[in-house]
Interface confidence: low
């Protein structure tokens, strides 16, 4: 992710006796929560690898960059960061690797400047549809988020709710159309089998979409047509077999796009002909000379760019009387 890093040193460590500060009282200007490090010059608070079980109540009002990584937060309740006065400057919030399994509706409310949120490496079995929108209104107030990092948030199989994980994540992304301003979305390493067709159409401002290291088999029902600002599309390390004409045309029509397709099990049969022709002509695919066939066996490791139409055949379908088991 590209979450900002602190540019200043001079971090002050907190004294343990400050841990019980009340969130309703304005924190002292130089106060730093227990188990955290603070730099007012860098507007940064780091509470990293401290096994915290809840968000500190006494965060300093100056904080712009908050790192709460490597903790044991388990649940983010509604208003987890609501303070008096509000954390009006908080722009970047990193909660990665903090054992979150539930993020409730309105967890990020009252953070008017929150631009970058990283929830990666948390086993999110229960992500409320209103985690980012804050309300169940059909159209919510726009979220200030422009960068949302959700890499590796898939919970273990036995902890998943009895519903589609893809559907749960997409519901949170689309609720109330609050994330219309989202520019970067990272969803890598989430075992996604498919991409719900609505998700991209309702995130028209995306510049960067990372879907790498999932299990996507096809993009047939996914439309990229309206993503005119899209600059990078990461589809490496999925289960893609072929890209069909409709998808190829849509990608080619995006004015600034770069597509990354490495390490997919491309099936080099007659259905691949259009994609091979397109690859030879297009400049949008980065590292296209590295793409190789995985199937059928006779084509394994052949470079897609080196194939011609004679190489791409489909075995004839035998009449039933000649088929064998």
């Amino acid at each position: 992710s590209s979450s900002p890093t602190s540019s200043a040193s001079s971090f002050s460590s907190s004294a343990p006796f400050l841990a019980s500060a009340v969130s309703a009282q304005p924190p002292l200007p130089d106060q730093c929560p227990a188990l955290c490090e603070c730099s007012e010059a860098a507007r940064t608070v780091k509470c990293v690898n401290r096994n915290l079980t809840e968000v500190p109540t006494d965060l300093p009002a100056y904080v712009r960059n908050l790192f709460l990584t490597g903790n044991q937060l388990a649940v983010l309740p509604a208003g987890a960061f609501a303070r008096r006065p509000p954390l009006a400057e908080l722009a970047a919030l990193n909660l990665s690797g903090s054992r979150l399994d539930e993020v409730r509706a309105g967890a990020f409310e009252h953070l008017p400047s929150l631009r970058q949120l990283d929830l990666s490496h948390n086993p999110l079995a229960d992500l409320s549809p209103f985690a980012f929108s804050g309300s169940n209104a059909s159209v919510s107030a726009p979220s200030p988020l422009v960068e949302l990092i959700l890499n590796h948030i898939v919970p273990p199989e036995d902890e998943r709710q009895n519903r589609s994980f893809e559907g749960m994540v997409v519901a949170a992304l689309l609720a109330g159309r609050a994330l219309q301003g989202l520019r970067r979305l990272e969803l890598a390493s989430n075992h996604f089998l498919y991409l719900p067709r609505d998700v991209l159409a309702q995130l028209p401002s995306l510049r960067h979409l990372d879907l790498s290291n999932n299990s996507l088999v096809s993009l047939t029902y996914v439309s990229f047509r309206n993503l005119t600002h899209l600059e990078s599309l990461h589809l490496e390390d999925n289960a893609l077999k072929v890209l069909h004409n409709g998808t190829l045309a849509e990608l080619q029509g995006l004015p600034h796009i770069r597509v990354f397709l490495d390490n997919n099990p491309w099936v080099c049969d007659c259905h691949m002909a259009d994609m091979v022709t397109w690859l030879k002509e297009t400049e949008v695919v980065q590292g296209k000379d590295r793409l190789t066939c995985a199937y059928p066996e006779k084509m394994r490791n052949r470079v897609l760019l080196e194939l011609n139409s004679a190489d791409l055949d489909c075995d004839p379908i035998l009449p039933p009387s000649l088929q064998t088991s």
């Epitope: 979450s3 900002p4 890093t5 520019r183």
Partner: antibody, heavy 118, light 107 residues
Framework: DVQLQESGPGLVKPSQSLSLTCSVT?????????WNWIRQFPGNKLEWMGY???????NYNPSLKNRISITRDTSKNQFFLKLNSVTTEDTATYYC???????????WGQGTLVTVSA | DIVMTQSQKFMSTSVGDRVSVTCKAS??????VAWYQQKPGQSPKALIY???NRYSGVPDRFTGSGFGTDFTLTISNVQSEDLTEYFC?????????FGGGTNLEIK
């Protein structure tokens, strides 16, 4: 805080190339965001020229596409503007600016005046 | 290219007044508009983004509004330091384009 500082020759001869440097402190240009060049002509009209992003990719104003190049030196945390075949019409104050993920320019350099004259 | 038109090159106002600077886009740009203030000899400074969001540290007397093609920057209770030039910018599509600027002057 993020700071940007332009530098380069203040006088360039017609038909030559204009080269400017933007030095960034307080944030690594490879960590994120978009690093732009914008110029302001006498009379104060502003023109967006193009950017290089944190991945090293470019996007240029089509009106300049055949003449412009924006590159970077990540080891020095600098990015560069090169504008070829300049004419007197390229006389302007040149700014470098950081573009946020949602496209507007939050941080600007102080600007450097470049005059194109024989 | 999208043309951003600030029809009034100069506007007169007085300290304490309320003034509205307008900007018109040649086509629909949604809310993808920013406003900048530029004082003589300085670089532009961001005031408003996404048509109505105030940038951090900008006084709340500055407000932005508008959608589609018509946008307004309103300064209530004008201060002497506000008497300078203001630019709008669209970022709905490339190339990004700016308005020609509006100078606020003392009446």
């Amino acid at each position: 805080d993020v700071q940007l500082q332009e530098s380069g020759p203040g006088l360039v001869k017609p038909s030559q190339s204009l080269s400017l440097t933007c030095s960034v402190t307080g944030y690594s240009i490879t960590s994120g965001y978009y690093w732009n060049w914008i110029r302001q002509f006498p009379g104060n009209k502003l023109e967006w020229m193009g950017y290089i992003n944190s991945d090293g990719s470019n996007n240029y104003n089509p009106s300049l596409k055949n003449r412009i190049s924006i590159t970077r030196d990540t080891s020095k945390n600098q990015f560069f503007l090169k504008l070829n075949s300049v004419t007197t019409e390229d006389t302007a104050t040149y700014y470098c600016a950081r573009e946020e993920y949602d496209y507007w320019f939050a941080y600007w350099g102080q600007g450097t005046l470049v005059t194109v004259s024989a | 290219d999208i043309v951003m038109t600030q029809s009034q090159k100069f506007m007169s106002t007085s300290v304490g007044d309320r003034v509205s600077v307008t900007c018109k886009a040649s086509q629909n740009v949604g809310t993808n508009v920013a406003w900048y203030q530029q004082k003589p000899g300085q670089s532009p400074k961001a005031l408003i983004y996404s048509a109505s969001n105030r940038y951090s540290g900008v006084p709340d007397r500055f407000t932005g509004s508008g959608f589609g093609t018509d946008f307004t920057l309103t300064i209530s209770n004008v201060q002497s330091e506000d008497l300078t030039e203001y630019f709008c910018q669209q970022y709905n599509s490339y190339p990004y384009t700016f308005g020609g600027g509006t100078n606020l002057e003392i009446k």
